[in-house]
Interface confidence: low
């Protein structure tokens, strides 16, 4: 015998009170999928949180952040603030990125810069909080010979851009 | 037939947590919702909250930092965390099934959960 | 949170009488309350849902009214087995929130 119930569409719940009368769903509720004997509730932007699509009968509120914010987790569970580029988000707020370590992103953590003479790589551009370093050819690579490159600067211990 | 049991640990020492299953059978948690409500002796009747058949929860909000419901479809199981229990949190405590426009249309026979030392 | 009082904490009829228990809530609620009946057991019952709509196998006697902030029960013919508590619920706005209650014992 097929559940009578099983004919109610999404947006419906399918009532035991009524005989599995398909009843629509009540505000600020939907069903996804047919077959329901109950409604979900909507999921209410709040606070941080913004919506970007509202709920309808068959499909779940959806929410982002607010300016200033980003999303974190499945479905925007959680908004996290903002950084500077160059920064990370600690327990005390947004805090500089430590020398030797960058972030080009609003959110994240920072990294370290990378390392060129692990790859026998001179530093082409160095880097700063808000940027990783470029790595230049090789000395070898430069040798009289080699295709015409423009010459590194100097190698030196990447540091800070002056701010 | 439509049932909901609770199971629960009786007595739990203040402080301490507390997890209630409530054991579903005649239906599947993944069409309705379940809701839990307390009672505390000679008092009335306190929602505390509902999990719906997609996983997703809502709270009371004076208890919401303590509670936590979870499922296992599968199992028919719902369960009820409540962490840092004080004296006042002993009561009856009732799964409800919510069907329809959410009404409880079917209760367990509730576990009575006291809180002492 | 929306607060839904019951002013008589019990009510005392006899057996044939018409009692009517009274809900109100702190705003509106459209319609959506439940009334639920507790034997001195503790077995918990669904009598009225939608604040008209009776459950299924509920006895025709019992009835629901209301609206707006104001809503009733009444039982036509007072029977024994009434002899219970009886608790308005809405859910109109989470988190849902319960009267409390209204003890009715035999005269």
């Known amino acids: 015998l097929q559940d009578p119930c099983s004919n109610c569409p999404a947006g419906t719940f399918c009532d035991n009170n009524r005989n599995q009368i398909c009843s629509p769903c009540p505000p600020n509720s939907f069903s996804s999928a047919g077959g329901q004997r109950t409604c979900d509730i909507c999921r209410q932007c709040k606070g941080v949180f913004r919506t970007r699509k509202e709920c309808s009968s068959t499909s779940n509120a959806e929410c982002d952040c607010t300016p200033g914010f980003h999303c974190l987790g499945a479905g925007c569970s959680m908004c996290e603030q903002d950084c500077k580029q160059g920064q990370e988000l600690t327990k005390q707020g947004c805090k500089d990125c430590r020398f030797g370590t960058f972030n080009d992103q609003k959110r994240g953590i920072c990294q370290p810069w990378t390392n060129c003479s692990l790859d026998g790589k001179s530093v082409l551009v160095n880097g700063t909080k808000e940027s990783d370093a470029v790595c230049g050819p090789s000395p070898a690579d430069l040798s009289p010979g080699a295709s015409s490159v423009t010459p590194p600067a100097p190698a030196r211990e990447p540091g800070h851009s002056p701010q | 037939q439509v049932q909901l049991k609770e199971s629960g640990p009786g007595l739990v020492a203040p402080s301490q947590s507390l997890s209630i299953t409530c054991t579903v059978s005649?239906?599947?948690?993944?069409?309705?919702?379940i809701n839990w409500v307390r009672q505390p002796p000679g008092k009335g009747l306190e929602w505390l909250g509902v999990l719906w058949p997609g996983g997703g929860t809502n709270y009371n909000s004076a208890l919401k930092s303590r509670l936590s419901i979870s499922k296992d479809n599968s199992k028919s199981q719902v369960f009820l965390k409540m962490n840092s229990l004080q004296t006042d949190d002993t009561a009856r405590y009732y799964c409800?099934?919510?069907?329809?426009?959410?009404?409880?249309?079917?209760w367990g026979a509730g576990t009575t959960v006291t809180v002492s030392s | 949170d929306i607060q839904m009082t019951q002013t008589t904490s019990s009510l005392s009829a006899s057996l044939g009488d018409r009692v009517t228990f009274s809900c109100s809530a702190s705003?509106?609620?459209?319609?959506?309350l439940n009334w639920y009946q507790q034997k001195p057991d503790g077995t918990v019952k669904l009598l009225i849902y939608?604040?008209?709509s009776l459950h299924l196998g509920v006895p025709s006697r019992f009835s629901g009214s209301g609206s707006g902030t104001d809503y009733s029960l009444t039982i036509s013919n007072l029977e024994p087995e009434d002899i219970a508590t009886y608790y308005c619920?809405?859910?109109?706005?989470?988190?849902?929130?319960f009267g409390g209650g209204t003890k009715l014992e035999i005269k």
């Open positions: 939608y604040t008209s």
């Open positions: 005649g239906f599947s948690l993944t069409s309705y919702a």
């Open positions: 619920q809405q859910y109109s706005k989470l988190p849902w929130t």
């Open positions: 705003q509106g609620i459209s319609n959506y």
């Open positions: 409800a099934r919510g069907s329809g426009t959410w009404y409880f249309d079917v």
